[in-house]
Interface confidence: low
Amino acid sequence: DEEFTNITDIKPPLQKPTHSFCAMKVDDGPCRAYIKRFFFNILTHQCEEFIYGGCEGNENRFESLEECKEKCARDYPKMTTKLTFQKGKPDFCFLEEDPGICRGYITRYFYNNQSKQCERFKYGGCLGNLNNFESLEECKNTCENGGGSGGGLNDIFEAQKIEWHEGGPPHHHHHHHHHH
């Protein structure tokens, strides 16, 4: 297996965020509420929407786009250049598939290090790990082709936007209310 090496070409340079929590990857937590929140994406230097589960998570979570921008985005020029890897695959390509601890049923793709191919799996909707792609193409571009564009160097640069899809086993017995 090729070892993952640090990136050598980042333009513009990554600046140190005003607050350290701005560099945290988005974390919707293990709970299953449906709360619209915003996080700062260190890869794009933009505030983006995500669905928060209602508990755990981290401080990179804001009630409004404005608050997110005020805390994290104001010191960054808009970043248009993608991060590139010198060689090898991002280290998260070697993580096992992980559906997380929630109970949605979302089709996602992961890189199977045994078969050396991207394969489909069912994702629960929260947590899990970064070996989790919305499309087969994105998975192939990131993990099958020896790198290319994508994130996941260290935790500080890892950020993913999680799409929440409600659902669960047929016997699931709760009355759902999208509160907050």
Partner: antibody, heavy 118, light 113 residues
Framework: EVQLVESGGGLVQPGGSLRLSCAAS????????MSWVRQAPGKGLEWVSA????????YYADSVKGRFTISRDNSKNTLYLQMNSLRAEDTAVYYC???????????WGQGTLVTVSS | QSVLTQPPSLSGAPGQRVTISCTGS?????????VQWYQQLPGTAPKLLIF???NRPSGVPDRFSGSRSGTSASLAITGLQAEDEANYYC????????????FGGGTKLTVLG
């Protein structure tokens, strides 16, 4: 019908070990995170540990970190709690429960009593 | 000492309305974390009563309702019945305790008469 049945409790000396099991039925076990919650005699509830549906993510209360290990065997629909270096304050009824909406535990087992005493 | 504070005991007559309070802090309820409520009848396992602040699982009577505001939450029981005599626990998440699910100390509800 959802059923969770704990076993493995008993009397153990301080410093000893015990392994609890929780047999699950009536739901797709691998689709659910599971937790252990304990209750000392005459006291309140205390969360101990949780594990993701796949077993890939584990969480522990500070009071048991480094001593207890949660695991699961999805092929056997069974949850485990390996308890090492047991202390008198670990004496409690241990419940397994499945994680559901909003961090709630929506189904609970009947509990198994662990007594740590010399 | 529990992270969430509940009154140790409460009592009410059949048919009355009782409210059990649960007081937290800025690191749990005040940080927008949901609260759950459990009922534990004598000698039995806890049962989920309210999840996500104010949602009832199916099978829980609508006599039970929950709310949360700021650093406090409450469980209201209307039309109190003898079978409601039990211990009630609130539960949430506390971000200051390295990712710990936390409970209140429990409230023993006695139905009089």
């Amino acid at each position: 019908e959802v059923q969770l049945v704990e076993s493995g409790g008993g009397l153990v000396q301080p410093g000893g070990s015990l392994r609890l099991s929780c047999a699950a039925s009536g739901f797709t076990f691998s689709s659910y995170a599971m937790s252990w919650v304990r209750q000392a005699p005459g006291k309140g509830l205390e969360w101990v540990s949780a594990i993701s549906g796949s077993g890939g993510s584990t969480y522990y209360a500070d009071s048991v970190k480094g001593r207890f290990t949660i695991s699961r065997d999805n092929s056997k629909n069974t949850l485990y709690l390996q308890m090492n270096s047991l202390r008198a304050e670990d004496t409690a009824v241990y419940y397994c429960a499945n994680n559901g909406a909003a961090a709630a535990w929506d189904y609970w087992g009947q509990g198994t009593l662990v007594t740590v005493s010399s | 000492q529990s992270v969430l504070t509940q009154p140790p005991s409460l009592s009410g007559a059949p048919g009355q309305r009782v409210t059990i309070s649960c007081t937290g802090s800025s690191s749990n309820l005040g940080a927008d974390y949901d609260v759950q409520w459990y009922q534990q009848l004598p000698g039995t396992a806890p049962k989920l009563l309210i999840f996500g602040n104010n949602n009832r699982p199916s099978g829980v009577p609508d006599r039970f309702s929950g709310s949360r505001s700021g650093t406090s939450a409450s469980l209201a029981i209307t039309g109190l019945q003898a079978e409601d005599e039990a211990n009630y626990y609130c539960q949430s998440y506390d971000r200051s305790l390295s990712g710990s699910m936390v409970f209140g100390g429990g409230t023993k509800l006695t139905v009089l008469g």
